[in-house]
Structures are given as structure tokens and as C-alpha cells.
Interface confidence: medium
Amino acid sequence: TFFQKPESCPPVPGGSMKLDIGIINENQRVSMSRNIESRSTSPWDYTVTWDPNRYPSEVVQAQCRNLGCINAQGKEDISMNSVPIQQETLVVRRKHQGCSVSFQLEKVLVTVGCTCVTPVIHHVQ
Amino acid sequence: TFFQKPESCPPVPGGSMKLDIGIINENQRVSMSRNIESRSTSPWDYTVTWDPNRYPSEVVQAQCRNLGCINAQGKEDISMNSVPIQQETLVVRRKHQGCSVSFQLEKVLVTVGCTCVTPVIHHVQ
């Protein structure tokens, strides 16, 4: 697998690998259109979770505000559905016992925002 | 910073840390509603990039299909805007010289999908 050495190489001691300090493109930032979460026809709110032993320590989750979508009159139209858009992302967990620090990758599912879709089934009035 | 040890601990040799093999929740998968990229009022297409020295090796980028949004008649309405939803994510880069393998984190901007928004009005003089 990705984290294993070639078969011809000696095995990794203690089941760990070397992680270089420093993050490539660390200062790269999302530059999205302003306030899209409130201007969207499928608006959403954000919840922030914070964990000092995780990198990034802040993970932001979106929750769709409505079941339907917002029409041109600003009213909810339940003939359309607001649905979450999800993304798998990696975070790094820090584990420490005294001066011994190691890291482990963790896969996290993040809801990034919402989009308005035509429904698969109309089962609601 | 996140990757530093407490001050009282000896420095890390060679600017690297221990990365445990194995990923927490590795088999966790995005489970989004079906075909939302084509059912959305702001539909999008996907481009896949593949790099064997990156984990995950596959990174999927979305591109909005239209500038406007799709109305109930299936036509593009340019009084509304399709905008990308972006997310910062981490990937792991593998660097190897012979049997010496190390890893480095890299921040990547991923466009996850698109949403339909009311435009910001730019008043032109």
C-alpha cells in the first residue's frame, strides 16, 4: 500500500514512518464568492468543531437550512430539495505520551455546503 | 505550532516526526444523494487527477457547467449565478530515494460542487 516500503527494503521499525515537518502550500486559502451560504437558493449554516490535538484544529461543517429551496420571492419551494455536498478530507491526529509524539492520519467527512436539486421522488406535500 | 514538541523535550532529529501507519476511518465514504451533480440547478462536471505519489492518489475537482442556474424549464437563467463551493483538504506526498521513504503533508484546494446564488449587484457608473 501507499505507506509501505518496497518489498526489497527492510521493514519499518515499530510500524511508523517519517513525516516531514512543514506543510506544502500551508498558506493556501479558499477564496469563495462572498456569503454564498446565505445567498444560495439552498442556504446553509456552519458549525465549527475545535480540537487542539488535530490539524487543522478547526473543522467546519455545513448544515442545510431548509428541506426545500428558496425561490425568487424568498419563499421555500418544497418541489425542490436542498441537499448537502460532502467531501472526504484528511486530518492529522497528534498522540503524545511525555516527550514521545507521533501522528496518525484520520479521514473525516465534511459537509461543505448545499445545492438545490430536482427531487428523485415527490412524496411530500 | 502543531508539529512542535514541548520546550522541555529534546529536539526532533532532522526535522521529521513519527507518522503511524494506518488511517483512522480509512473506509469511511462520502454517501451523497444520487446524481446531484446533474440534478442540481447549478450542475457540475468532475475532473479526476491521479498521482501515485500522493494519498489519496485520486483527487476529484468539480467545474460548474454554467454561469447561470437551470430553471424549472431546463433553461439557463442568467439572473442567477452558479458558483463553486471550495474546501481546503490535506493530502500526503511520498518522497523516496531508494529505501529511504518520507512523507509530507500538502494543502490542496478542492472544488467540491456548485450552488446557485442570487448575484451580488455591481453598480456601474
Partner: nanobody, 123 residues
Framework: QVQLVESGGGLVQVGGSLRLSCEVS????????MGWFRQAPEKEREFVAA????????RYAHFVKGRFTISRDNAKNTVHLQMDSLKPEDTAVYYC????????????????WGLGTQVTVSS
């Protein structure tokens, strides 16, 4: 591991009321759309009511509209269904579940259900 425990069902006369509760563990109800569903004998499971992720935005199947009210208690991680003006055709086992895609969630997308709570309306 998500667990859903429905309660509050029973035998009631036509026109009567019941309040169903669903205790959820392993899932914060405040972060998900939640729904009630029902299954009558020899029938498919059907959607009854939904409440959105944020606040109290709720939606109902046409056959319960105006009679049933869905609500949530985030502090207790519980979802309720207040059932008034009950009719014999409301007789069914009632289930609650999260609705990960809101109203776009399909019955065949569920992996887990609770045991449900039986509601019987007698005339």
C-alpha cells in the same frame, strides 16, 4: 453505532392522540434532518414527517398534514411526533430515522432502523 429507540405507541380510539418519542444515540439530531416513517401490515414503509437540520422547518405527508406535528429536543437528542385526530388508517408501526439528504432521502438508502413503536387506532 447509531441506535434509534422509538416509544409512545399504543391502542387509542378514533379521534384520540398519542405522542411518540425517538431517542437517538450515536448521532447528534441537531445536525441532521430527522424523519418519522410508518409501515402498515402488507404495505411499504412510507414517509410521514420531517424536520430540518436547523430550527423547526418541518414537512408532512399529505395524509397526516394538519393532524401530526414533528419536533425535536436537541438537549435530549430526541425527536417527537405528536399525533392528533387519529384515524383507523393511521394504524401502523412508526419508525424514526435521520434523513441525510433531507427530503431527497430514499427508503432504499437506509442501512439501519429501530424496532419501531406500534400504533393501533380502533373504531
Amino acid at each position: 453505532q447509531v441506535q434509534l429507540v422509538e416509544s409512545g405507541g399504543g391502542l387509542v380510539q378514533v379521534g384520540g392522540s398519542l405522542r411518540l418519542s425517538c431517542e437517538v444515540s450515536g448521532l447528534p439530531v441537531s445536525s441532521y434532518a430527522m424523519g418519522w416513517f410508518r409501515q402498515a401490515p402488507e404495505k411499504e414503509r412510507e414517509f410521514v414527517a420531517a424536520i430540518s437540520w436547523i430550527g423547526g422547518d418541518s414537512r408532512y405527508a399529505h395524509f397526516v398534514k394538519g393532524r401530526f406535528t414533528i419536533s425535536r429536543d436537541n438537549a435530549k437528542n430526541t425527536v417527537h411526533l405528536q399525533m392528533d385526530s387519529l384515524k383507523p388508517e393511521d394504524t401502523a408501526v412508526y419508525y424514526c430515522n435521520d434523513m441525510p439528504y433531507g427530503l431527497d432521502t430514499r427508503m432504499d438508502e437506509y442501512e439501519y432502523w429501530g424496532l419501531g413503536t406500534q400504533v393501533t387506532v380502533s373504531s
